[in-house]
Interface confidence: low
Amino acid sequence: EVEKTACPSGKKAREIDESLIFYKKWELEACVDAALLATQMDRVNAIPFTYEQLDVLKHKLDELYPQGYPESVIQHLGYLFLKMSPEDIRKWNVTSLETLKALLEVNKGHEMSPQVATLIDRFVKGRGQLDKDTLDTLTAFYPGYLCSLSPEELSSVPPSSIWAVRPQDLDTCDPRQLDVLYPKARLAFQNMNGSEYFVKIQSFLGGAPTEDLKALSQQNVSMDLATFMKLRTDAVLPLTVAEVQKLLGPHVEGLKAEERHRPVRDWILRQRQDDLDTLGLGLQG
């Protein structure tokens, strides 16, 4: 808490400019009007304030806006954002994607902080769903963002947003998350032709049910072993040898190298030896 002191004569700030970097903390508190600061927040980032000085400026804004800052101020917080606590951010109502981008830019290159996580949560809740533009922005800053969401949170992702998802964005997703994302992807890509569809849906197939895999096996997709190994075991088990052969196409020979790993191991154990022998790979059920 900065002690309340009168502003020395001639030091009252008329605008937010570089002369303020020479002000002591108590002078900033006494001589900078909070309303002036709020209207000229965009200038703060151009001035090399110390972190101690930024603490004072934050304090002034907190006094002016005890219920939470307006978006006009939030958008121009810049490095002052790093001073905010999750509790501060929970008071905000952020609706502009430009505001979100500006604040994420401040944190760029760092791990997702609790402040950023809270900001994103407030933003997405305010929008009601995780739309394509938001998802584009978030995955650009944090490639693992999508997989940090719970299945329930992923439920609010509309199928149209799936177009923004890149394969690397799904790298850390677990099966429960893919279970939610896969049907959305299927809807999103439903109008694509067979080969294009497979390219797009491939990253999501860890959430595919058995019958969708059966259907894919009829479409000459030649799934690679890396994708096959990420499929749900319960979805793979009911597939026949013929269906797996069609699904993998020329990649079927890779089953031998993976015969001790799930889901290949469990699938092999479900098959008749006579059927496995038709593959000519020496797989033992």
Partner: antibody, heavy 119, light 107 residues
Framework: EVQLLESGGGLVQPGGSLRLSCAAS????????MTWVRQAPGKGLEWVSG????????YYADTVKGRFTISRDNSKNTLYLQMNSLRAEDTAVYYC????????????WGQGTLVTVSS | DIQMTQSPSSLSASVGDRVTITCRSS??????LAWYQQKPEKAPQSLIY???SLQSGVPSRFSGSGSGTDFTLTISNLQPEDFATYYC?????????FGGGTKVEIK
């Protein structure tokens, strides 16, 4: 054994409201998307509305959009259909159904509940 | 919306006959098609999903085929309990849509 039991149907005047319920047993309700399908007397099947496992995503036929609301309470294993501004053409047997392994196919259906909209 | 057209709308057949019902979609739906059987005053029952996969517990005399826009349900050895109305349904995209139904009656 999977069982879906609809209730809440009855006679209602045009413009009125009804809330249908579908109590599910014999399945892990929270793991399945659910749907409502209706059948007007002597007519074919018409899909009405669907809902995701968490309730976060809902889908509606154009004929009911803005008037009907689908919801679910996973703690009670129950699916709901709130029907407002009912019209004569909403008269039908309403079935709730559980999605099968495929996203939009349905492997178990309730016995249906009749909704009659008439003055 | 995707329109589903079934034919014929009704047919008469005898026990032991081979019966074929066709379903055509107004645009390509891949293999995202299901078939249901409905008896009078009863709820529909699932027969086939993914165009050709037999639902658990359904007799093997029922089979499905097709992909894209043209699909077929075949009952190879019609039994007394098979006299009912059959519906196809696409689940390629929302809104989900059903065919108008085919009523299979005793000749």
């Amino acid at each position: 054994e999977v069982q879906l039991l609809e209730s809440g149907g009855g006679l209602v005047q045009p413009g009125g409201s009804l809330r249908l319920s579908c109590a599910a047993s014999g399945l892990t309700f929270r793991s399945y998307a659910m749907t409502w399908v209706r059948q007007a007397p002597g007519k074919g099947l018409e899909w009405v509305s669907g809902i995701s496992v968490s309730g976060g995503i809902t889908y509606y036929a154009d004929t009911v959009k803005g008037r009907f609301t689908i919801s679910r309470d996973n703690s009670k294993n129950t699916l709901y259909l709130q029907m407002n501004s009912l019209r004569a053409e909403d008269t039908a047997v309403y079935y709730c159904a559980k999605r099968g392994a495929a996203v939009g196919s349905f492997d178990y259906w309730g016995q249906g509940t009749l909704v009659t909209v008439s003055s | 919306d995707i329109q589903m057209t079934q034919s014929p709308s009704s047919l008469s057949a005898s026990v032991g006959d081979r019966v074929t019902i066709t379903c055509r979609s107004s645009q390509g739906i891949g293999s995202w098609l299901a078939w249901y059987q409905q008896k009078p005053e009863k709820a529909p029952q699932s027969l086939i999903y993914a165009a050709s996969s037999l639902q658990s517990g359904v007799p093997s005399r029922f089979s499905g085929s097709g992909s894209g826009t043209d699909f077929t349900l075949t009952i190879s050895n019609l039994q007394p309990e098979d006299f009912a109305t059959y519906y196809c349904q696409q689940y390629n995209s929302y809104p989900l849509t059903f065919g108008g139904g085919t009523k299979v009656e005793i000749k």
